[in-house]
Interface confidence: low
Amino acid sequence: AVDLTLLANLRLTDPQRFFLTCVSGEAGAGRGSDAWGPPLLLEKDDRIVRTPPGPPLRLARNGSHQVTLRGFSKPSDLVGVFSCVGGAGARRTRVIYVHNSPGAHLLPDKVTHTVNKGDTAVLSARVHKEKQTDVIWKSNGSYFYTLDWHEAQDGRFLLQLPNVQPPSSGIYSATYLEASPLGSAFFRLIVRGCGAGRWGPGCTKECPGCLHGGVCHDHDGECVCPPGFTGTRCEQACREGRFGQSCQEQCPGISGCRGLTFCLPDPYGCSCGSGWRGSQCQEACAPGHFGADCRLQCQCQNGGTCDRFSGCVCPSGWHGVHCEKSDRIPQILNMASELEFNLETMPRINCAAAGNPFPVRGSIELRKPDGTVLLSTKAIVEPEKTTAEFEVPRLVLADSGFWECRVSTSGGQDSRRFKVNVKVPPVPLAAPRLLTKQSRQLVVSPLVSFSGDGPISTVRLHYRPQDSTMDWSTIVVDPSENVTLMNLRPKTGYSVRVQLSRPGEGGEGAWGPPTLMTTDCPEPLLQPWLEGWHVEGTDRLRVSWSLPLVPGPLVGDGFLLRLWDGTRGQERRENVSSPQARTALLTGLTPGTHYQLDVQLYHCTLLGPASPPAHVLLPPSGPPAPRHLHAQALSDSEIQLTWKHPEALPGPISKYVVEVQVAGGAGDPLWIDVDRPEETSTIIRGLNASTRYLFRMRASIQGLGDWSNTVEESTLGNGLQAEGPVQESRAAEEGLDQ
């Protein structure tokens, strides 16, 4: 069974001091066999017993092993069902605690009832505050039965449930008609899936005979031991104030386990700790009684004395539950109640015995679950005991179960059963996961799902260059941490595999499947500098940069240019794939936009440091192009241009710009402003005779717009050489915009 205990502090004078604590003694609590398992959950279950809403309860975690619920403000907060859930996967287990109000009209004589399939269960509700109304019994919140108020027997209302079956399990309540549900007596009925002393799928297996009030689990045949007892059959008492499957937990506070209710996995239910009884677990056991709820009687013989926590304490020369066995009868000493080994190992098991006559090697034997008897290969004889050592053949899964050490002498015989768990070493089902990579290191998550048994004690990571025949390098890591493989070669593929181990000899599992992880190439370290930039249009920008001069080859594959448009929150990235490039033309930008620009060297997927940024403002986009531009020669020095205004203008045109260029000429074009935007014609003067010219024009609003189509026209012949073209109107005031 899962080692899970729900503790309720029943010192109820002040609800604010009330708390519930759930404690897990599981190895690696919070760890499932697939990776990290689910945490402990502790909550109030309002499905059956609903209480008025109050302030939320406070949950405090103490590591993965303990969780505490506090913050109860009034007594009614306490009434109802609380549950703790722990364990992982198929072992996930719910422990339930039912709390009754001490001031209720009806109180349960006993809250938890564990019965066997087919038994008759009797729930008894004691009258605490009498009302002369009927009593309603409910099962899991639904109406079940009614008793007339005068059917009380000796101040109690009894509900008899004959021939109970597992579906009858649940929360039962007895409530006076028309009384508050908080005044009910709440019970918990647990019906084992088998008859008394049996367990297993068809109830064909025999329970081990649980001692000291332990309850045989109907699924796995294990004893769920009362708080304060341990061992395969609950045969050993813990020291006072201790609980848990291995007595590993300690009751809080100076008065030990007084005032605490302990709830354990079904089919045990809840009880006081060992040595205590009463509805609030505050009364010590009466003389001659011991154990949880003081349900056990000592009946010590041969001068034994009764200890309320552990039972009979025998005088020298006697042993046994009731001190009924003479020390002359042989006795198995200090045999562990449970042993764990790994599959296919060949462990040595020791069994020590004392007695008179003294046990010898041949008088001690070991019996496996299949009935095979092993004889000891060696015995160590000491004055007070003989220890026989058994060499166990290679273990198989079928060896899991109850083994028995038996000693026989002429003085009698003794035997001790103990449980052997054969565990399967874990084997990874998946390859490790690459988290990050650099040029000389890989960061790997080694924790993968696995077959076989946990807990994982060590994780080995094996790695070597891909397709290499060299020996594997191995690193042993903590199961819960990511691993950094150091001192690797850059730009190299590595085969990486996980090997998991569980505790104990032979706990190493087979290697898991490999995965290929490739180191990055060296990080580029040079920082470029933006040398200059100029606008080549409303949406085009030419950028140039330089790199510091350093000796040796350039480490880099190219450059990344980044333009950040802060207004729109957009980033544009331009990849320049040559490490030799020092200039780039960026096109398709948004006119009228303020950009932040920087450049970085890259190598593989790694980026070097960015250049200091530049801030560039692109001019706003202008209007569309003028339409139907036409040129007509007027003389040997004049050509008239006519056009139509652009369509769909975003605003009033401020001017037109005319570009004039000699056809086939190598010189720069001349730009002439037409400052009267309402005009649709102009005469260009001062041209050379018999010369062919090219004309195009564009409009301007806030920025220059698109160029029109280009037109050609020749001046007429026989003119003189002119000084240069000018526009007809206000020609003297016009400058040529180069």
Partner: antibody, heavy 120, light 107 residues
Framework: EVQLLESGGGLVQPGGSLRLSCAAS????????MVWVRQAPGKGLEWVSV????????GYADSVKGRFTISRDNSKNTLYLQVNSLRAEDTAVYYC?????????????WGQGTLVTVSS | DIQMTQSPSSLSASVGDRVTITCRAS??????LAWYQQKPGKVPKLLIY???TLQSGVPSRFSGSGSGTDFTLTISSLQPEDVATYYC?????????FGQGTRLEIK
């Protein structure tokens, strides 16, 4: 003797659902990963899904991701495949197989398969 | 996902011939490759695992070789009962993809 027995196949309309089961016996079911593989009529084998021994980890082929769900009940030694939003191209024989547990990477144990036909 | 490509798609050979089927992975998979034989109406049968290890009970005329990206299944002397479709499957990373299959017939 290891045995895997699939069931739950049949004729279903496009967009419909089925739940395929695979009952396992003859080995400790809770110690092995399990997989589903399918084979369309006259076509090759297609790997569909995997689940780890405890059921805590699953994986799917891209072609079924979001529509199929693999699960298992170790107490019943049974593997399941819930198939939703079925399409004509999901018509196939669905096999369950036992995943390997160590160095021997290969599927040695297969079920006999169950046929799923998606047609209107 | 890793793609597995088998060649040829089908082949016809005579009894006693040496037959070779190849399988290529789209990226390195070490030696994590299995070969299966499937006869009409039957379930696949594991022949070879980890590229070259013969599954117990499989006739020794079957052998496998290769690692990384290129793998070969060889039948040293073809027998009538070897008529089947043969598949490769990678186990290096999920999904554990299969090749498209090679149909083998007797001439």
């Amino acid at each position: 003797e290891v045995q895997l027995l699939e069931s739950g196949g049949g004729l279903v309309q496009p967009g419909g659902s089925l739940r395929l089961s695979c009952a396992a016996s003859g080995f400790t079911f809770s110690m092995y990963g399990m997989v589903w593989v399918r084979q369309a009529p006259g076509k090759g084998l297609e790997w569909v899904s995997v689940i780890s021994p405890s059921g805590g980890n699953t994986g799917y082929a891209d072609s079924v991701k979001g529509r199929f769900t693999i699960s298992r009940d170790n107490s019943k030694n049974t593997l399941y495949l819930q198939v939703n939003s079925l399409r004509a191209e999901d018509t196939a024989v669905y096999y369950c197989a036992r995943a390997p547990r160590g160095y021997s990477y290969g599927y040695y144990y297969w079920g006999q398969g169950t046929l799923v036909t998606v047609s209107s | 996902d890793i793609q597995m490509t088998q060649s040829p798609s089908s082949l016809s050979a005579s009894v006693g011939d040496r037959v070779t089927i190849t399988c290529r992975a789209s990226q390195g998979i070490g030696h994590y490759l299995a070969w299966y034989q499937q006869k009409p109406g039957k379930v696949p049968k594991l022949l070879i695992y980890t590229a070259s290890t013969l599954q117990s009970g499989v006739p020794s005329r079957f052998s496998g070789s290769g690692s990384g990206t290129d793998f070969t299944l060889t039948i040293s002397s073809l027998q009538p009962e070897d008529v089947a479709t043969y598949y490769c499957q990678q186990f290096n990373s999920y999904p554990h993809t299969f090749g498209q299959g090679t149909r083998l017939e007797i001439k």
